[in-house]
């Protein structure tokens, strides 16, 4: 028995508006009905929780109202979008998946997605 496998892209470049999207896919060993997905950020030897959501299979992913994350689920795949990113938010974003119900509980952690965020250059002042 090994840890549940979680796949995510190695690298993602955020858009000029500070939005990054990636897919987190897990190989479910059973028929989970309740799944918890957490996005963690590791940078400079610090680990912080970016956002987390618990969802019932077949239902929408619901993050807290003030969360910078949104997402949708389809089978064993979660499409995650993180917004409001700035250059200082560049780092390794790790997808953690927990199969909460029914038992047995399983935990899987992806190898991380390096998200690069480049702050847009300010527009030059216009003479018009």
């Amino acid at each position: 028995c090994k840890a549940m496998h979680v796949a995510q892209p190695a690298v993602v470049l955020a858009s000029s508006r500070g939005i990054a999207s990636f897919v987190c896919e897990y190989a479910s060993p059973g028929k989970a009905t309740e799944v918890r997905v957490t996005v963690l950020r590791q940078a400079d030897s610090q680990v912080t929780e970016v956002c987390a959501a618990t969802y019932m299979m077949g239902n929408e992913l619901t993050f807290l109202d003030d969360s910078i994350c949104t997402g949708t689920s389809s089978g064993n795949q979660v499409n995650l979008t993180i917004q409001g990113l700035r250059a200082m938010d560049t780092g390794l974003y790790i997808c953690k998946v927990e199969l909460m119900y029914p038992p047995p509980y399983y935990l899987g952690i992806g190898n991380g997605t390096q998200i690069y965020v480049i702050d847009p250059e300010p527009c030059p002042d216009s003479d018009f």
Epitope: M4, S45, I94, Y105, L107, I109
Partner: nanobody, 127 residues
């Protein structure tokens, strides 16, 4: 699936020793980091120590007093606690995390990466 069971808590006098055990069933320990954490009343759960195949890491507050080890043949991780102090009083938990290539000495014990938490065992240091 992994199932962890810990044992070894109890009441001990200041300066005394205790050994906690965390036994795994359902899986070999090999692909996992095993961590010890503790939570005192009214405080957040904090890292004590963790171990993978080749590395160990300790919280500053226990360095030199606590030793973590693993016995792969018995599928068990031990936490030897010496020179115990009143401030070590807490509920101690064992947990597991899949060992990942991006873990560093500073992050491999981070509680965010862990699951399979045990119920906890009480350690009380008092005279």
């Amino acid at each position: 699936e992994v199932q962890l069971v810990e044992s070894g808590g109890g009441l001990v006098q200041p300066g005394g020793s205790l050994r906690l055990s965390c036994a795994a069933s359902g899986s070999t320990l090999d692909p996992f980091v095993i961590g010890w954490f503790r939570q005192a009343p009214g405080k957040e759960r904090e890292t004590v120590s963790c171990i993978n195949r080749s590395r160990t890491s300790y919280a500053d507050s226990v360095k030199g007093r606590f030793t973590i080890s693993r016995d792969n043949a018995k599928n068990t991780v031990y936490l030897q606690m010496n020179s115990l102090r009143a401030e070590d009083t807490a509920v101690y938990y064992c947990a597991a995390s899949p060992d990942k290539p991006f873990y560093t000495d500073q992050t491999m014990c981070n509680k965010h990466y862990y699951g399979y938490w045990t119920q906890g065992t009480q350690v009380t240091v008092s005279s």
